[in-house]
Amino acid sequence: LQDLCSNCPAGTFCDNNRSQICSPCPPNSFSSAGGQRTCDICRQCKGVFKTRKECSSTSNAECDCISGYHCLGAECSMCEQDCKQGQELTKKGCKDCCFGTFNDQKRGICRPWTNCSLDGKSVLVNGTKERDVVCGPSPADLSPGASSATPPAPAREPGHSPQ
């Protein structure tokens, strides 16, 4: 016996209450594939969620987060509060990064500054709560008479453009 329900198109459901008619999905529901015996309830983007794409009879709604929040998880399943750069979100809210750590985004955690000395380099620019340190040449590279990997550019005479 052929299962007629399997032929009901997306946007409908095979309604057993109504003798297997391929009935359009009721309001606020959808079926993204054919052969469905029920329509799925549309996701509602409420509270900290806002609608990015409306629900249709064949596809679910898609949500974003309202201003001041960002998406987490598959299909934006959660919204997490934004913090400022130089902060991280804790159970008690946004807290400044501890000394020696930084966060250059509105989300995520504070990460330790790069330890330049581990690579045998020196600190060229100090780190802040918002920015990592910038490592420069090793102290040995900066000593007088040290050979440079790239020769210095020739000095130009004033008033002359390069050839």
Epitope: L4, N7, C8, P9, G11, T12, N17, R18, S19, Q20, I21, C22, S23, P24, C25, P26, P27, T38, C39
Partner: antibody, heavy 118, light 112 residues
């Protein structure tokens, strides 16, 4: 726009058959079920049967079960309703109607008058 | 078969006044999805019927908000908050849940 256009009026003798067509346009024909409803002069509307346009399976009211055939031609986006062994009580306006929302017939044809007279 | 009983059968109304039509079903029209499968149609003189309300209380596309449907068990009501001249015709309730789908006998709304 979405519409259903039915074939013209028919005059039939008792015992004969009539076949009414309903051509759909402006939407995906195979997505929506099609129903047939009739209305005898001065009477209430009477549901006759439906066809799952995309699949072709049908369900009929018991009252017409032995005399009605609903068929469809998907390539022509057309549904047909054939009623046999006509009698005088079958004189009515016959409507096709699309089930466009859950259980609701949102688009109706203009109706086809079928007269049964000897 | 599910019997649909409408009242009144005739309803004279003054334009701008409200109107109410009742429909009672002999059995529950509650679908397993939680909706009552009850429709309201208006058939204007010389025209095909048009869908007003489906699933008991949801206005069909393009239907003015002066039309509303309510439900209580097997009792259903169509309300028109302010009747306009264009609302004249015969109003039918219908159940599309159990075969054979059945209509009420109709309520003829006319302007006083």
């Amino acid at each position: 726009q979405v519409q259903l256009v039915q074939s013209g009026a028919e005059v039939k003798k008792p015992g004969a058959s009539v076949k009414v067509s309903c051509k759909a346009s402006g939407y995906t024909f195979t997505t929506y079920p099609m129903h047939w409803v009739r209305q005898a002069p001065g009477q209430r509307l009477e549901w006759m049967g439906w066809s799952n346009a995309g699949i072709g399976n049908t369900k009929y009211s018991q009252e017409f079960q032995d005399r009605i055939t609903i068929s469809r031609d998907t390539s022509a986006s057309t549904v047909y309703m054939e009623l046999s062994s006509l009698r005088s009580e079958d004189m009515a306006v016959y409507y096709c109607a699309r089930e466009g929302v859950a259980g609701g017939f949102d688009i109706w044809g203009q109706g086809t008058m079928v007269t049964v007279s000897s | 078969d599910i019997v649909m009983t409408q009242s009144p059968l005739s309803l004279p109304v003054t334009p701008g006044e409200p109107a109410s039509i009742s429909c009672r079903s002999s059995q529950s029209l509650l679908h397993s999805n939680g909706y009552n499968y009850l429709n309201w149609y208006l058939q204007k003189p010389g025209q095909s019927p048009q869908l007003l309300i489906y699933l008991g209380s949801i206005r069909a596309s393009g239907v003015p908000d002066r039309f509303s449907g309510s439900e209580s068990g097997t009792d259903f009501t169509l309300k028109i908050s302010r009747v306009e001249a264009e609302d004249v015709g015969v109003y039918y309730c219908m159940q599309p849940l159990q075969i054979p789908y059945t209509f009420g006998q109709g309520t003829k709304l006319e302007i006083k």
